[in-house]
């Protein structure tokens, strides 16, 4: 807490300018009028205040607006936004996309903080829906934001937004989300050539159907085991040994280390043992030679 002290003679701030960087914390508290600060917030971001000085400026705004800052102030918070707590932000009513962009810009290049998450939540709730413009803005700043949306919300994501997604941004997506995102990614990257296409689509393949995996197996993509292990089990099961071998290329040797884990374990159980033996990896658990395999799902469809 900053001490309440009188402003020294001649130090009363007439405007928010760079001369204030030389003010001690107590001088800022005593000599800067909160209303002046609020009307000239756009200048604060251009002035190299220290974090301690920013604490004082925030304190002055908090006193002036105990119920929450008006949007005219919020839009110009700049780096002062980094000083806000989620509790502060919950008092705000942010309706302008420009305000949202201005604050996201401050946090650009960093992980989504609790402050940003709260800001986005307040903004989306204030708008009543997640419209395309908002989503474009959020995915531009935080591609990982996609994984925090429900499959229903993801259905409105434009394929163009997919271009901004980095592989690590999908780490927290579950299969239901990837089911929605994969077709959009496929559409977004459809005009790329084979190897470039695979690089881009790879992180979305957790939502790929069997037929797309079969198609990829014909393109010498050399999928790594980490990607293979994230594929949908139901999409992997129908693949033949030959198709998996082509899909993985030199990485096929990694199957041995993963033979106890899904989806490899389930896939092995569906393959003939003599087919598995052709891989020369010592994979065990396939259908013994001479056994007849009935596809019950097909039988049900025919009856």
């Amino acid at each position: 807490e900053v001490e309440k002290t009188a402003c020294p003679s001649g130090k009363k701030a007439r405007e928010i300018d760079e001369s204030l960087i030389f003010y001690k914390k107590w001088e800022l508290e005593a000599c800067v009028d909160a209303a002046l600060l609020a009307t000239q917030m756009d200048r604060v971001n251009a002035i190299p205040f220290t974090y301690e000085q920013l604490d004082v400026l925030k304190h002055k705004l908090d006193e002036l607006y105990p119920q929450g800052y008006p949007e005219s102030v919020i839009q110009h918070l700049g780096y002062l936004f980094l000083k806000m707590s989620p509790e502060d932000i919950r008092k705000w009513n942010v309706t302008s996309l420009e305000t949202l962009k201005a604050l996201l810009e401050v946090n650009k290049g960093h992980e989504m903080s609790p402050q940003v998450a709260t800001l986005i939540d307040r903004f989306v709730k204030g708008r009543g829906q997640l419209d395309k413009d908002t989503l474009d803005t959020l995915t531009a700043f935080y591609p990982g934001y996609l994984c925090s949306l429900s499959p229903e919300e993801l259905s409105s994501v434009p394929p163009s937004s997919i271009w901004a997604v980095r592989p690590q941004d999908l780490d927290t997506c579950d299969p239901r989300q990837l089911d929605v995102l994969y077709p959009k990614a496929r559409l977004a990257f459809q005009n790329m050539n084979g190897s470039e296409y695979f690089v881009k689509i790879q992180s979305f393949l957790g939502g790929a159907p069997t037929e797309d995996l079969k198609a990829l197996s014909q393109q010498n993509v050399s999928m790594d085991l980490a990607t293979f292990m994230k594929l949908r089990t139901d999409a992997v099961l129908p693949l033949t040994v030959a198709e998996v071998q082509k899909l993985l290329g030199p990485h096929v040797e990694g199957l041995k280390a993963e033979e106890r884990h899904r989806p490899v374990r389930d896939w092995i159980l569906r393959q003939r043992q003599d087919d598995l033996d052709t891989l020369g990896l010592g994979l065990q658990g396939g259908i013994p030679n001479g056994y007849l395999v009935l596809d019950l799902s097909m039988q049900e469809a025919l009856s």
């Epitope: 020294p8 960087i21 030389f22 001690k24 001088e27 190299p48 220290t50 000085q53």
Partner: antibody, heavy 120, light 107 residues
Framework: QVQLQESGPGLVKPSQTLSLTCTVS??????????WSWIRQPPGKGLEWIGY???????YYNPSLKSRVTISVDTSKNQFSLKLSSVTAADTAVYYC????????????WGQGTLVTVSS | DIQMTQSPSSLSASVGDRVTITCRAS??????LNWYQQKPGKAPKLLIY???SLQSGVPSRFSGSGSGTDFTLTISSLQPEDFATYYC?????????FGGGTKVEIK
């Protein structure tokens, strides 16, 4: 580590302008965490703070010398400079440049100092 | 301006002695006080900042205390290299000001 080195004439005539330059090495003068100060010490006496500058060019001077002092910065050369006009014998002193930690205003490191004598 | 008064202005002590130097500010300066050591012909060297924080590389026999208007620099066991002049400096308000100095001499 950061080192500071003062340079300039050791003798200045009364009424003329004293000019000194401080060259910073081992670190950038554009660091946002520091001010760059000038401090002087008359022979056998104590220390007097003259003023400081931020890399952006903003300055703050000791009111007792404000009318005669100009501090400037050249970030491209990693230097800052002092000009003291209308000097008298009372301005004879060892002049130090120093790095000043923002918020707490402690001086570290200092230059080795340069004696400036005002005499005709 | 804030005036800084040091006492004593000089003192004589022997190696191994415990030495205490005091600094008083003309108004409360919280913990905005720094201590420096200066040897003849040399620039001052920062010992203590923010009243009690030991600067990196400074021997632990040096310590600082105090808050408000009264501050103390203590050398727990005086060493030959500690004979020098010591200055306090307030950084609570500009202009930044120094105490008049305390000269520690060999007894």
């Amino acid at each position: 580590q950061v080192q500071l080195q003062e340079s300039g004439p050791g003798l200045v005539k009364p009424s003329q302008t004293l000019s000194l330059t401080c060259t910073v090495s081992g670190g950038s003068i554009s660091s946002g965490d520091y001010y760059w100060s000038w401090i002087r010490q008359p022979p056998g006496k104590g220390l007097e703070w003259i003023g400081y500058i931020y890399y952006s060019g903003s300055t703050y001077y000791n009111p007792s010398l404000k009318s005669r002092v100009t501090i400037s910065v050249d970030t491209s050369k990693n230097q800052f400079s002092l000009k003291l006009s209308s000097v008298t014998a009372a301005d004879t002193a060892v002049y130090y440049c120093a790095r000043d930690r923002r918020d707490w205003d402690w001086f570290d490191p200092w230059g080795q100092g340069t004696l400036v004598t005002v005499s005709s | 301006d804030i005036q800084m008064t040091q006492s004593p202005s000089s003192l004589s002590a022997s190696v191994g002695d415990r030495v205490t130097i005091t600094c008083r500010a003309s108004q409360s300066i919280s913990s905005y006080l720094n201590w420096y050591q200066q040897k003849p012909g040399k620039a001052p060297k920062l010992l203590i900042y923010a009243a009690s924080s030991l600067q990196s590389g400074v021997p632990s026999r040096f310590s600082g205390s105090g808050s408000g208007t009264d501050f103390t620099l203590t050398i727990s066991s005086l060493q030959p290299e500690d004979f020098a002049t010591y200055y306090c400096q307030q950084s609570y308000s500009t202009p930044l000001t120094f105490g008049g100095g305390t000269k520690v001499e060999i007894k």
